[in-house]
């Protein structure tokens, strides 16, 4: 999902050149210090160079910009605003650059930005207006089509006194700027829940990756608005069962493929509807691999091989008959 480059010939800028030209305006298409540039591939790579800020002298031709493996810490408003603007910049990869704060309007003045990867940054402070650029109730539409936010959860001791899920969702929903978003990756973020309003406001989503989180239930999540969703990745969560409402919604999405591997499915009486659905549906990828985790007597049983007699719930004893 991250921007890739087919560049074969990159010109490097030696560090000593930077100071030599810093007093005068940058040349239009020079290559920033500590970066590699290929005008033919429209690609600039400033990778693993411990940069503490975004280079100011990025060439106007840049279409793919890699700023991975740096020490950026903060992305301020207008971090990529240039005169003339970086009008061609379509793919921006900032993964693994130790960002802990992304401020409002950080990506403003990038009219062609379609792919943004902020993965593997401990984002303790993601402004609600990081992607929308303004606090208007309806912002100008963002050009973003793909937003990759895998493993952006900060260590617990660095989190603000608020829900991390809520912070991320606020940024996704602000100003309805991301109505055109087609791919959203939120894997490996310790999400315990998915706020119920988030999906309703991202109607163009085709691919949603929520894998490797801690989702226990989808009861309050609605997929109905995601009319053209093609992939829903829910692998490696803490899901126990999918209930009828969710099953019906997924079955009603004609283009969806659902990925459910490695969840601790509880094979009791509440699982009966899901087992019936799994036997009939074509939408679940690798459904024959899904196995029970609980109760102990059912561990490793294949869901598709279960029948109603296997799926029982221990009767709940009335309080007078319970022993301590």
């Amino acid at each position: 999902s991250s921007p890739t480059s087919s560049a074969s010939s990159f010109s490097s800028s030696a560090p000593f050149l930077a100071s030599a030209v810093s007093a005068q305006p940058p040349l239009p298409d020079q290559c920033p210090a500590l970066c590699e540039c290929s005008e033919a591939a429209r690609t600039v790579k400033c990778v693993n160079r411990n940069l503490t800020e975004v280079p100011t002298d990025l060439p106007a031709y840049v279409r793919n910009l890699f700023l991975t493996g740096n020490q950026l810490a903060v992305l301020p408003a207008g971090a990529f605003a240039r005169r003339p603007p970086l009008a061609e910049l379509a793919a921006l990869n900032l993964s693994g650059s130790r960002l802990d704060e992304v401020r409002a309007g950080a990506f403003e003045h990038l009219p062609s930005l379609r792919q943004l990867d902020l993965s593997h940054n401990p984002l303790a402070d993601l402004s609600p207006f990081a992607f929308s650029g303004s606090n208007a109730s309806v912002s100008a539409p963002s050009p973003l089509v793909e937003l990759i936010l895998n493993h952006i959860v900060p260590p617990e001791d660095e989190r603000q006194n608020r829900s991390f899920e809520g912070m991320v969702v606020a940024a996704l929903l602000a100003g309805r700027a991301l109505q055109g978003l087609r791919r959203l990756e939120l894997a490996s973020n310790h999400f315990l829940y998915l706020p119920r309003d988030v999906l309703a406001q991202l109607p163009s989503l085709r691919h949603l990756d929520l894998s490797n989180n801690s989702l226990v239930s989808l009861t309050y999540v609605s997929f109905r608005n995601l009319t053209h969703l093609e992939s829903l990745h829910l692998e490696d969560n803490a899901l126990k069962v999918l209930h009828n409402g969710t099953l019906a919604e997924l079955q009603g999405l004609p283009h969806i493929r659902v990925f459910l591997d490695n969840n601790p499915w509880v094979c009791d009486c509440h699982m009966a509807d899901m087992v019936t659905w799994l036997k009939e549906t074509e939408v679940v990828q690798g459904k024959d691999r899904l196995t029970c985790a609980y109760p102990e007597k059912m561990r490793n049983r294949v869901l598709l091989e279960l029948n109603s007699a296997d799926l029982d719930c221990d009767p709940i004893l009335p309080p007078s008959l319970q022993t301590s």
Epitope: P3, R206, E230
Partner: antibody
Amino acid sequence: EVQLVQSGAEVKKPGATVKISCKVSGYAFSSSWMNWVQQAPGKGLEWIGRIYREDGHTNYNGKFKGRVTITADTSTDTAYMELSSLRSEDTAVYFCANGGAMDYWGQGTLVTVSS
Amino acid sequence: DIQMTQSPSSLSASVGDRVTITCRASQDISNYLNWYQQKPGKAPKLLIYYTSRLHSGVPSRFSGSGSGTDFTFTISSLQPEDIATYYCQQDNTLPWTFGGGTKLEIK
């Protein structure tokens, strides 16, 4: 922008098999679904089937089932449609179309079945 | 299979006219109805998906409405470049099926 480039025209004898390719570029924003559609000369459009390129899952139109095989090679971003036991009524232009709602189409491949 | 019935099969109109094409499904398809434009010798192009959503880059003179079984496609002000055949298609229930097409000509 997603672009689909199909292989060239084919002339086949009745009973033969044809395999058409469709290469996707602009892949970052393309769909996982690749559809195939038939258009006989002067006629309308008929959906043949589709493949989910990431895992190879397919759906076919019953009218073509048993004679058609759709495959995909993710390493080359190419999808294929193979139609066997060809007959004269299979003479048509075959299109690949990317997306759930068939957002982008290839230029078409004319297959002529004639003895 | 769901049958899609398009009408009229051909239509003649003048530049600037408002043009309407209808499509009827043999059973409920919710809003999973797409409209395509095909010019002679060319591949079809998606104009509208999910009944009324405009595909990227499609002029706003094209619009769609309806739900369930009855759908309408409208060109608010016909332009010379709109001369083509238009197809509706449902993608609610496999196999996907197309209408028979409407050939649009200039008077």
